[in-house]
């Protein structure tokens, strides 16, 4: 009896959909695996007789519930199928946006770039998929614990009237208000402001 794959799960970030599993202990030899997806009531092979413990399902429609399954095989024997259901638009993790930060005197000028999507044109980003897409920005004075959050209305934001010669850290994430779903924070970017632009009297 061939044991089934263990810990079967979907790892999906920005619609890069990777079905992952672990190979069970099996004394007779090395197992191979076949992963399938349900299409129009028929299961179709995606990865056949692979020795890998993952299979790329990024070509699935972003919409709707998909049934995926994987089994282990050895010679002419095979395990039972392990099934999971997956809805990409609901289940994919929103990866961190890109961010460009520029210091101008006592201001930080930020521009945000929505995450790119697997198997899409360069210009079709997560912002195109989700109508309610917005950004959350949090910033803080480096070395302090107090964080401030803002929700920019556009793909850019300016933090003005900051303390001069002070290092501020900024990070951004995607946020979907209609789903109350937050993405992953970008890595903090820390920049030092320069002088206060106000002219002394």
């Amino acid at each position: 009896m061939v044991p089934p794959p263990e810990n079967v799960r979907m790892n999906s970030v920005n619609f890069k959909n990777i079905l992952q599993w672990e190979s069970p202990a099996f004394a007779k030899g090395n197992l191979t695996f076949t992963a399938q997806y349900l299409s129009y009531r028929i299961f179709q092979d995606k990865c056949m007789n692979t020795t890998l413990t993952e299979c790329d399902f990024s070509s699935l429609s972003k919409y709707g519930d998909h049934t995926l399954r994987v089994r282990a095989e050895f010679a002419d024997e095979h395990s039972d199928w392990v099934n999971i259901t997956f809805c990409p638009v609901d289940d994919t993790i929103i990866g961190p946006p890109g961010m460009q930060v520029e210091v101008l005197a006592d201001s930080l000028h930020m521009r945000f770039l929505a995450p790119k999507i697997e198997n899409e044109y360069e210009t079709w980003t997560m912002k195109n998929v989700y109508n309610s897409w917005t950004y959350n920005v949090q910033y803080w004075k480096n070395g302090t614990d107090e964080k401030f959050q803002i929700t920019p209305q556009y793909d850019f934001e300016v933090l003005r009237n900051l303390e001069p010669w002070t290092t501020y850290c900024v990070q951004v994430r995607g946020f979907l208000p209609d789903r109350n779903k937050a993405g992953e924070w970008s890595e903090p970017v820390c920049e030092q402001t320069t002088h206060d632009e106000t002219v002394p009297s």
Epitope: K62, V89, N119, E120, T123, N131
Partner: nanobody, 124 residues
Framework: EVQLVESGGGLVQPGGSLRLSCAAS????????IGWFRQAPGKGLEGVSC????????HYADAVKGRFTISRDNSKNTVYLQMNSLRAEDTAVYYC?????????????????WGQGTMVTVSS
Amino acid sequence: EVQLVESGGGLVQPGGSLRLSCAASGNSLDYPTIGWFRQAPGKGLEGVSCISASEGSTHYADAVKGRFTISRDNSKNTVYLQMNSLRAEDTAVYYCAASLHGLGCKSEADYDYWGQGTMVTVSS
């Protein structure tokens, strides 16, 4: 039942132009995303371009960027693909497709309705 009908294909010399049309019959072309795809002889289906209804944004495959332009005329329920500076490698059957959910642009899996296709041949 919605039907998409492509037209405008034909034989054209390298460097020439063609304008493909995709008309919706039986319903308005009221879908979030309309895309153009192509299939060259002996090859798989390839995304060419799409247009989003909501913001009117347009998106292109690298191979056609700067040469092809997608547009839509809502009053005529038609989407166009203007193809300039055509090359031999653009030879293919071109298909128009409509997405009900509008979540994707390039992947054929994200489209629900398809036309029958129109042949474009680029040859001297």
